[in-house]
Amino acid sequence: VPRWRQQWSGPGTTKRFPETVLARCVKYTEIHPEMRHVDCQSVWDAFKGAFISKHPCNITEEDYQPLMKLGTQTVPCNKILLWSRIKDLAHQFTQVQRDMFTLEDTLLGYLADDLTWCGEFNTSKINYQSCPDWRKDCSNNPVSVFWKTVSRRFAEAACDVVHVMLNGSRSKIFDKNSTFGSVEVHNLQPEKVQTLEAWVIHGGREDSRDLCQDPTIKELESIISKRNIQFSCKNIYRPDKFLQCVKNPEDSSCTSEI
């Protein structure tokens, strides 16, 4: 008799998930000498242990602690770039500006980026058919809890001036329900972080509005200032030129406003 399987609203575990995580871990530790000591089999075992045989709506941050411990990594705390709803540009930026780091430039972020995973209660199976959706099913699912855990730790580690890249094309440039708005903002430590600098990325070529005056940016400023952290904001009117000037800062066109 075929065993009844829970149908969730979200997509199932990414195919070849174990192999992908292991391969990414090996690749990352080869490229980053400071992480060469990491045993990728142990990392996979800890990752697997966080969600296998557990109800996928009942995952806690504690479940991920063994993985967090193995993935402990020191990044320069004053070189952190957060992002919200504009991941690709943030990653393009840190690929050029190699001394700055997004969460996905760390081992744990790199392992899980763009992947989905979940298990089933009381079986050692990975569910490749469906996984819980954050809105439609439950928020304490393996993927959401993972990102909440690593995002919290990443924000807590930040110091001095922290940068955040925000998508100026969205109706809510700052969305308090995003990972940045609900986790990272609230875990920047006022004792260490002096300023949060927002970079608002414009979408349209003819868009000359000052998006730093957007009500959602004012809301971000309010949340940040209440934490006793200074706030500043810059419009990035031409993201293509912005990246080009990061690559070639000596270019004569890079002295004008981007």
């Epitope: 919290r152 809510k172 308090k176 708005g181 609900s182 986790v183 903002v185 609230h186 875990n187 006022p190 009500p215 959602t216 004012k218 809301e219 400023e221 309010s222 949340i223 200032s225 209440k226 934490r227 006793n228």
Partner: antibody, heavy 125, light 109 residues
Framework: SLEESGGDLVKPGASLTLTCTAS?????????MCWVRQAPGKGLEWIGC????????IYYASWAKGRFTISKTSSTTVTLQMSSLTAADTATYFC???????????????????WGPGTLVTVFS | DMTQTPASVEVAVGGTVSIKCQAS??????LSWYQQKPGQPPKLLIY????LAASGVSSRFKGSGSGTEYTLTISGVECADAATYYC????????????FGGGTEVVVK
């Protein structure tokens, strides 16, 4: 509306928990929910606030840290736990909502627009 | 923290009264004014330094200021304006002793 409860006559050194219950709105829209006290014949004294969108953002007056704890206990209740009470803590305790001031519930300092009637805490020996 | 002056002021009906509030650091115009009458909770009058809080608040109440210096002006004072007025900063909740000023009692003659 807001209503505070839990005020009482207590002895020095005692602990007490006050509850603030919201009706007509809930915390699924994010607010700063604040506690303010007023000793008899004195001015308003800010105790602290909790951002209802994140339990990581709780703020206290410097004098209140350690002895006072603010928590969101449900989508309509916030509590204030007080310990090691002294006669100086005798006051009316108010719960207040720091309202959103922009469109679509953006919070950027709209002031405390909604207050409870207050609950009296008396510390006596 | 917030320094409010004067502590008490007497004003005749129809007169004008100004209450000042000084912040220890810039508060970005995130300042509110409240009116409190005996036995009642405070009532929000003005937010963001100059915006009237609700349609029920009389336009006789006017807020102004920026940076660290703010003023509440009540013109055409009425008997019903007799109350204690408080300013409150909403800019930073870190390392704050009191977000409220000490209060100003307005006595109407």
């Amino acid at each position: 509306s807001l209503e505070e409860s839990g005020g009482d006559l207590v002895k020095p050194g005692a602990s007490l928990t006050l509850t603030c219950t919201a009706s007509g709105f809930d915390f699924t829209t994010y607010y700063y929910m604040c506690w303010v006290r007023q000793a008899p014949g004195k001015g308003l004294e800010w105790i602290g606030c909790i951002y209802t969108g994140s339990s990581d953002s709780i703020y206290y007056a410097s004098w209140a840290k350690g002895r006072f704890t603010i928590s969101k206990t449900s989508s309509t209740t916030v509590t204030l736990q007080m310990s090691s009470l002294t006669a100086a803590d005798t006051a009316t305790y108010f719960c207040a909502r720091d309202r959103p001031s922009g469109n679509d519930d953006y919070i950027y300092d709209g002031g405390m627009d909604l207050w409870g009637p207050g609950t009296l805490v008396t510390v006596f020996s | 923290d917030m320094t409010q002056t004067p502590a008490s002021v007497e004003v005749a009906v129809g007169g004008t009264v100004s209450i000042k509030c000084q912040a220890s650091q810039t508060i970005n115009s995130w300042l509110s004014w409240y009116q409190q009458k005996p036995g009642q909770p405070p009532k929000l009058l003005i937010y963001q330094a100059s915006k009237l809080a609700a349609s029920g608040v009389s336009s006789r109440f006017k807020g102004s200021g920026s940076g660290t210096e703010y003023t509440l002006t009540i013109s055409g004072v009425e008997c019903a304006d007799a109350a204690t007025y408080y300013c409150q900063q909403g800019y930073s909740f870190g390392n704050v002793d009191n977000a409220f000023g000490g209060g100003t009692e307005v006595v109407v003659k």
